[in-house]
């Protein structure tokens, strides 16, 4: 067959759907690869063709659109499963073509099973709620387009295994779940199950997301440097190892980039000739406040190194701070035989 622009397998779109549930999958060509939409393509005389390669097979085969009850169908640029079966897992290709033009892309579809508590291999989106911040809501995700607005579905919300009912601070409100005041105890997996009728059949959509309660912007502060500080002096003799930790606390801030770095005599360590290594470790509190520690290390410090200025810097969306470490050369201890003896008046 003639040449076709093949965008390959779009692994960025690893689509996971639950067994025995409806799934609507848009052809990725129009979302990520082409500069025009399906309507434009269709009115220009282009045809959208679907085929698939089932799991552990190399053979591309057409999709059977003549299954009982139209289990698999195509509508515009959407491939519909009503519902999915486990063996629908495979790589699906949508190809847009006419006699002079051809473009195609493949994407993996994985049909997964869930257990009785909605656990599954599904990758879960994470929704962050601010601690003690007032009413916040999560919305049952990815259910648009499954049923018309005239259909009134029923929605059941679960936390883990249990229906959400009589919770002190969590209230199901249709497609939304309201947290009156989010607490650490609200961390966990939340599942909404949307049930709706269609053509004399009942369908269910299961959507699980992870809720993580994080620090509130009301409590956020600029970075706090705990070390170095004015109470600790790094006193070394030449030849010894110099280790200076820079420990910085960052309040949780949504989408903030937290940075810690050292300067030596105003320059980044990479820009100077001395043999410096820097090791970083990061820890998080339960509300995702962050503590970063960068340990500056000079294996064999020289007297020149001990005269330099070592400054720890930190920056977040809340501001920038810096703190110099107190470094000095250790005064050698007196040598007993000579200095002490002299002091006793020995000649």
């Amino acid at each position: 067959s003639e040449r076709c622009d093949d965008w390959g397998l779009d692994t960025m779109r690893q689509i996971q759907v639950f067994e025995d549930e409806p799934a609507r999958i848009k052809c990725p060509l129009f979302e990520h690869f082409l500069k025009f939409n399906y309507s434009t393509a269709h009115s220009a005389g282009l045809t959208l063709i679907w085929y698939w390669t089932r799991q552990d097979r190399d053979l591309e085969e057409p999709i059977n659109f003549r299954l009982p009850e139209n289990r698999i169908s195509k509508e515009k640029d959407v491939l519909w499963f009503r519902p999915t079966l486990l063996n629908d897992t495979g790589n699906y290709t949508c190809m847009l073509r006419n006699t002079t033009y051809c473009s195609k892309v493949a994407f993996p579809l994985e049909v997964v099973q869930k257990d009785s508590c909605f656990n599954s291999p599904m990758k879960l989106p994470v929704h962050k709620l601010y601690i003690e911040y007032g009413i916040q809501r999560i919305t049952c995700p990815n259910v648009d387009g499954y049923f018309p607005s005239s259909v009134k579905p029923t929605i059941t919300w679960y936390m883990g295994c249990y229906k959400i009912q009589n919770f002190n601070n969590v209230i199901p409100e249709g497609m939304n779940l309201s947290f009156l005041i989010a607490l650490i105890s609200n961390n966990g997996n939340y599942t909404c199950v949307v049930t709706y009728p269609e053509n004399g059949r009942t369908f269910h959509l299961t959507r699980t997301l992870t809720v993580k309660v994080v620090g509130s912007p009301k409590n956020a502060v600029p970075p706090v440097i705990h070390s170095p500080n004015d109470h600790v002096v790094y006193e070394k003799e030449p030849g010894e190892e110099l280790l200076i930790p820079c420990t910085v606390y960052f309040s949780f801030l949504m989408d903030s980039r937290n940075e810690v770095w050292w300067t030596i005599d105003g320059k980044k360590p990479d820009d100077i000739t001395i043999d410096v290594t820097i090791n970083e470790s990061i820890s998080h509190s339960r509300t995702e406040d962050e503590t970063r520690t960068q340990i500056l290390s000079i294996k064999k410090v020289t007297s020149e190194d001990l005269k330099r200025s070592y400054v720890c810097h930190a920056r977040s969306a809340k501001g920038e701070v810096a703190k110099a470490a107190k470094v000095k050369q250790k005064v050698p201890a007196p040598r007993y035989t000579v200095e002490l003896a002299c002091g006793f008046g020995a000649t």
Epitope: K114, D115, S116, T154, T156, Q165, N166, T195
Partner: antibody, heavy 117, light 107 residues
Amino acid sequence: QVQLVQSGAEVKKPGSSVKVSCKASGYAFSSSWMNWVRQAPGQGLEWMGRIYPGDGNTHYAQKFQGRVTLTADKSTSTAYMELSSLRSEDTAVYYCGEGYLDPMDYWGQGTLVTVSS
Amino acid sequence: DIQMTQSPSSLSASVGDRVTITCQASQGINNYLNWYQQKPGKAPKLLIHYTSGLHAGVPSRFSGSGSGTDFTLTISSLEPEDVATYYCQQYSILPWTFGGGTKVEIK
């Protein structure tokens, strides 16, 4: 399209056990709850318990705890309800009922179990 | 266990009549209530789930309402094929429990 076909009527002696089967088709057997409900002659409905074939998780009504065992064979899409230490008051029609969530969307045709000496 | 009390236990109405059956729970069940229809000699069928959600394929003359502990099944215009026993069932807290049933007959 969902079908639940139960095994035939049974006559049992007091003290014995009965095992009723329920063969499912037309849906993903592993991904739905299978409930068991009984109905004594001329009486109402009584929930006995349920099993999730996907992971074998079970819940039983306290009244039947220790006397009823629910199992499921995923390879044949068949659920089983075994009731032991039968007594005359266990004479009833036993139904299996499938539910994706908690409501029992579809029911089997029922199996009459008669306990008589 | 949650007790479910249905009333009346039986009723007789004419074709075309509006029929109302009530169900009371011994404690709040957060709308987790189903209604089933059982015709003589047959298995029950789900009519309504979650208080008011019409099950697929069920005629629109059936509707459900209520909240807290008090719930209602309404048949807006009784048809001859509606002769059956109707059961409410709570699924708020295990074990699931049913009402005693309401037998509906045609006058």
